[in-house]
Amino acid sequence: CDLPQTHSLGNRRALILLAQMGRISHFSCLKDRHDFGFPEEEFDGHQFQKAQAISVLHEMIQQTFNLFSTEDSSAAWEQSLLEKFSTELYQQLNDLEACVIQEVGVEETPLMNEDSILAVRKYFQRITLYLTEKKYSPCAWEVVRAEIMRSLSFSTNLQKRLRRKD
């Protein structure tokens, strides 16, 4: 399965939108930095069959979409930017879903690498717990925004490596 060129453009657009979503000076939020334990090893792309890598990417985008679709998120961010960001993520999910179906047929592998998917879910649980503990403060959201930008960058790099394998 070849992810369409529009997919990588959408990825870039999502990152740009996320960068634009900042509402407060992040310099006031240093003390709120937190170790979310991003599962970096799940995104190095070496140990995966392509179907598994795509499943992990799908989970990453799905969880990001869920995080930014909550009521608390709507209260934190500028609505039009949030809607555009969600639209980009939704389009990426569609692209990845089509690919997952295609790749599973070709490789005859299980739909997901369960451990990897679980690692991504637990990562987002830690993010949600952090936001709850910080009472969804503006700084907490800034820290999460920075973290998601970083994790989406890892996702983008994994997609580039997958394209090079084709």
Epitope: A19, L30, F36, R150
Partner: antibody
Framework: EVQLVQSGAEVKKPGESLKISCKGS????????IGWVRQMPGKGLEWMGI????????AYSPSFQGQVTISADKSISTAYLQWSSLKASDTAMYYC??????????????WGQGTLVTVSS | DIQMTQSPSSLSASVGDRVTITCRAS??????LNWYQQKPGKAPKLLIY???SLQSGVPSRFSGSGSGTDFTLTISSLQPEDFATYYC?????????FGQGTKVEIK
């Protein structure tokens, strides 16, 4: 390979202006902040200020606020430190260093080689 | 501003010695504390971040500990290339501040 390359040594007279640079390569320039640190001859390290190149937001140490200006041009992955009117007491080595921003990652993990600024009449 | 105070300001030691440098913050900084090494004419080099995490490529003889206001940098067995000046730095709030430095010299 991550690199921060600073502009060369400068010799200036009191009252003159100066702009020194720090060019980042080998990483996404807008994903990290760039900080500036002063080291006067034989002395310790003093943090001057920082910039987020993604939006050019800045923060300064109170000791340097109004004395210097930090800026960046993300299109050429370069940060700047400038003075409008130098004093003899500005004579020092100036370092730039990258900072991970709000991410949980090492602070100031890469440094420029330093720019020696000498101000003398 | 958060003041960072290092002790001692200088020390003499021999190759193979265990060396300990302390850093005290004027208020709690949790674990937002970094250690740097600087050799004459060179830029500082990050050794330890978040109080106890060893920076990639730094020898394991360097270790950091502490939280709140009191922190320690330990060199378990001093090597010839370790003679340098060491700085602590808090990274919990602006303005970021450094300790005054500890110079480690050959005995």
């Amino acid at each position: 390979e991550v690199q921060l390359v600073q502009s060369g040594a400068e010799v200036k007279k009191p009252g003159e202006s100066l702009k020194i640079s720090c060019k980042g390569s080998g990483y996404s320039f807008t994903s990290y902040w760039i900080g500036w640190v002063r080291q006067m001859p034989g002395k310790g390290l003093e943090w001057m200020g920082i910039i987020d190149p993604s939006d050019s937001d800045t923060a300064y140490s109170p000791s340097f606020q109004g004395q210097v200006t930090i800026s960046a041009d993300k299109s050429i992955s370069t940060a700047y430190l400038q003075w409008s009117s130098l004093k003899a007491s500005d004579t020092a080595m100036y370092y730039c260093a990258r900072h991970p921003g709000l991410n949980w990652a090492p602070d100031f993990d890469y440094w420029g080689q330093g720019t020696l600024v000498t101000v003398s009449s | 501003d958060i003041q960072m105070t290092q002790s001692p300001s200088s020390l003499s030691a021999s190759v193979g010695d265990r060396v300990t440098i302390t850093c005290r913050a004027s208020q709690s900084i949790a674990e937002f504390l970094n250690w740097y090494q600087q050799k004459p004419g060179k830029a500082p080099k990050l050794l330890i971040y978040f109080a106890s995490s060893l920076q990639s490529g730094v020898p394991s003889r360097f270790s950091g500990s502490g939280s709140g206001t009191d922190f320690t940098l330990t060199i378990s067995s001093l090597q010839p290339e370790d003679f340098a000046t060491y700085y602590c730095q808090q990274s919990i709030d602006f303005p970021l501040t450094f300790g005054q430095g500890t110079k480690v010299e050959i005995k």
